[in-house]
Interface confidence: medium
């Protein structure tokens, strides 16, 4: 069986799949996923291995019409290091010189200047190219190569080993070299995998079985850090509690080098925030930090000075915590604004079971803002996903130069922000450079400000705008309005009528469904409509709501359904990646990110059109 | 490399008790499970009594409720109490520990202390 890093090369225009027959004969053979032969795998950025002979594809030297054999993987050759180029074509690094089938006297596969269909290869059995299946780092863990990452293959005992192995050892741990040749250089670590015993490498707290692993003797970058612990299906510690940071403060006392976690600002337009989207509440820095740098946008622990926190420069090289297991933010569920009946006074804005309303020209401080909209029988709003968020911005009519009151303060309990109604905190948006929680100025309070409607610690006594937000009360069946411009069950936004398609279809249905509807699969024209969109799908149970972006006309070029530019984009992390595919909304935590999807996958979606009387613009010229 | 150093063996009367220590030190991680063994004669060398990082046991049948094996993380050390001793458990004990060290291999032995059950 093949494992989801191995793949067969095949030639489309012959049909066949390239074959190492022996280290010195790689020809091509009818495809057999069967055959070790013809299995290969990516064990760099550049080289590729046999898996039979765990040597790697080279060639003796850069020049057109030479034999492309095996040869001991070595990650310094430049006769090793092969790039995908545009499409298929697979060749040298820095050459024009491509990997060809050879010919009918040439039973070889060769290097050759000729990028024609000889030269074309693809994974079997997929459209995708040799890159589509590339390399991930693997970092390890303990050992005494302070957590550098594998190399595959790695020589232990004059044996090679291309994945991670327990030789050498009765207790099934698994590890790998990190260089080459072991048995000259001595260089190992454990591999980040799930194996018999390694859950002794992470630390329990019995009190909320969160389980915390300290990577002390690692020197890591953050993103490699990151990197790491994801890849032990975990992220870089955050901490939202009180009792969590003195249980790390227990967990490390016995360490003096700092230590990554997953703070950051590395959102170009948003303040502090957590890699594993836990939100920002709760702050323990170092007297002196966040210092405002450029550049120092990650942070790390410091056992040393009490496990206070200072942000460094993501390129350093430290030790990190990795945090997986239970979270304490799923407890508090949201409702989702299709399940709730909102009925609101007048001048009250409805969403998701409850009523808003922004307060911009009685201008108060936080505690009378606070007084007030006790009064109307809410309190200062809360805010707990980015859809809740997104519908505040784009539906009640919030401006760009707004400065108003939340409900959020650490009032209470200094360094440790808590909404005024007393429901969790389960999500924040900072401004970039916020919280900046500056003790000479006692900023204890939160606004909403900024075209995004970002948040940003304030002094309580400043006379502000601020916002309600109240219960609804529900009052018998739901009468639905029909919007004006947009016919029953659409909803309007600006211009246009949207429509949730509520049957499970594939992009091309969902497509042929909308264009029945005299509509067509949505586009997404800027974060305004975005904004919009979010709120419309985000807080729904289905996980994803098809768009009209695809790559299918053209691969890696993603266009809309109709003839439209795109002028916005707003891709989930490692998105679009080389994923050829149909794009979709992502709802949940991931609220109204891109993801590509295989375009045959089932997904509910979204319908557009021009509401009835409106005027469309002119088509700006380019 | 990681060394072994088992101690508190000697010549005890039929009926009696004793306690092994074997200590553990060098380029460990952490430790995964640290027992005792002694020669046996179909095998070169039978398990007696092992315990993991987390405190799990096993004990060989023949030494079950007389003998009782404990550990102190923080020391690296593995300890054996032996109650109710009788002369065929005369043997060299010898401490092994499989750990997770800073090199690949896991399996290290002691080397050995002689307890002697006689009148």
């Known amino acids: 069986l093949l494992d989801t890093r191995q793949f067969l090369i095949y030639n489309e225009d012959h049909k066949r799949c390239v074959d190492a027959v022996s280290p010195s004969a790689v020809q091509t053979a009818a495809c057999n996923q069967d055959a070790e032969s013809q299995k290969f795998r990516w064990v760099s950025e550049s080289q590729i291995m046999s898996v039979a002979f765990k040597l790697c594809l080279g060639v003796p030297s850069k020049t057109d019409w030479v034999a492309i054999t095996l040869y001991a993987c070595d990650s310094k050759s430049e006769f090793q290091k092969w790039e995908c180029k545009n499409d298929t074509l697979l060749g040298i690094k820095g050459e024009d010189l491509f990997f060809n089938y050879g010919n009918r006297q040439e039973k070889n596969i060769m290097l050759y200047k000729g990028s024609g269909l000889w030269s074309r290869w693809k994974i079997y059995g997929t459209t995708d190219n040799l890159c589509s299946r590339g390399y991930e780092a693997m970092y390890t863990l303990l050992g005494n190569a302070n957590g550098a990452t594998c190399a595959f293959p790695f020589k232990f005992e004059n044996k090679w080993y291309a994945d991670c192995t327990s030789a050498g050892r009765s207790d099934g741990w698994l590890w790998c070299g990190t260089t080459t040749d072991y048995d000259t250089d001595k260089l190992f670590g454990y591999c980040p995998l799930k194996f018999e015993g390694s859950e002794s490498l992470w630390n329990k707290d019995p009190l909320t079985s969160v389980s915390y692993q300290i990577n002390s003797k690692s020197a890591l970058t953050w993103h490699q850090a990151r990197k790491s612990c994801q890849q032990q299906n975990a992220e870089l510690l955050s901490i939202t509690e009180i009792h969590e940071q003195t249980y790390l403060t227990g967990l490390t006392s016995s360490l003096t080098s700092g230590l990554w976690i997953g703070l950051n600002s590395l959102s170009f337009n948003s303040g502090w925030q957590w890699s594993d989207r836990s939100p920002f509440r709760y702050l323990n820095w170092l007297p002196g930090s966040p210092s405002a740098e450029p550049g120092k946008s990650c942070v790390s622990l410091n056992p040393g000075k009490n496990a206070k926190w200072e942000n460094l420069e993501c390129v350093q090289k430290l030790g990190y915590i990795c945090k997986k297991g239970n979270t304490t933010l799923n407890s508090f569920v949201i409702p989702s604004e299709s399940d709730v009946p909102t009925h609101c006074p007048s001048q009250w804005w409805p969403y998701a079971g409850h009523c808003y309303k922004i307060h911009r020209d009685e201008k108060k401080i936080q505690r009378d803002a606070l007084t007030t909209c006790r009064k109307e029988g809410g309190d200062l709003t809360s805010i707990h996903t980015i859809e809740e968020l997104d519908f505040i911005i784009s539906q009640l009519g919030y401006e760009p130069n707004d400065e108003l009151w939340i409900g959020l303060n650490d009032i209470k309990i200094q360094m440790y922000f808590e909404w005024s109604d007393g429901t969790p905190v389960t999500f924040t948006k900072w401004l970039r450079g916020e919280p900046s929680h500056e003790n000479n100025r006692q900023e204890d309070c939160v606004v909403m400000k900024g075209k995004d409607g970002y948040w940003a610690d304030r002094g309580c006594e400043w006379p502000l705008g601020y916002i309600c937000k109240m219960k609804s009360r529900s009052q018998g069946p739901e009468i639905v309005e029909v919007e004006k411009g947009c016919r029953k069950g659409w909803k309007k936004h600006h211009f246009y009528c949207y429509m949730i398609g509520h049957t499970l279809s594939t992009f091309a249905e969902a497509n042929q469904t909308c264009n029945n509807e005299n509509a067509y699969l949505t586009t997404i024209e800027d974060r305004y409509e975005q904004a919009f969109l979010t709120s419309f799908v985000g807080l729904r149970p289905e996980k994803y709501f098809w768009t009209g972006l695809s790559d299918i006309q053209t691969k890696g070029t993603f266009q809309w359904t109709i003839e439209e530019e795109v002028r916005f984009t707003h891709w989930n992390s490692d998105m679009p990646g080389r994923k050829p595919g149909c794009v979709a909304m992502r709802t949940g935590i991931a609220g109204g990110l891109w993801d590509v999807l295989k375009c045959d996958e089932k997904a509910k979606f979204v319908c557009k059109h021009w509401a009835e009387g409106v005027t469309h613009p002119p088509k700006p010229t380019t | 490399y990681v060394q072994l150093a088992e101690s508190g063996g000697g010549l005890v009367q039929p009926g009696g008790s004793l306690i092994l220590s074997c200590a553990a030190s060098g380029s460990i991680c952490t430790s995964n499970a640290m027992g005792w063994y002694r020669p046996a004669l179909w095998k070169q060398r039978e398990e007696v009594a092992d315990i993991t990082s987390g405190g799990s046991?096993?004990?060989?049948?023949s030494v079950k409720g007389r003998f009782t094996i404990s550990r102190d993380n923080a020391k690296n050390t593995v300890y054996l109490q032996m109650n109710s001793l009788k002369p065929k458990v005369t043997a060299v004990y010898y401490c092994?520990?499989?750990?997770?060290?800073?090199?690949?291999?896991?399996?290290?032995w002691g080397q050995g202390t002689l307890v002697t059950v006689s009148s």
């Open positions: 046991t096993n004990y060989a049948d």
């Open positions: 092994k520990a499989v750990v997770v060290t800073t090199t690949p291999y896991s399996d290290y």
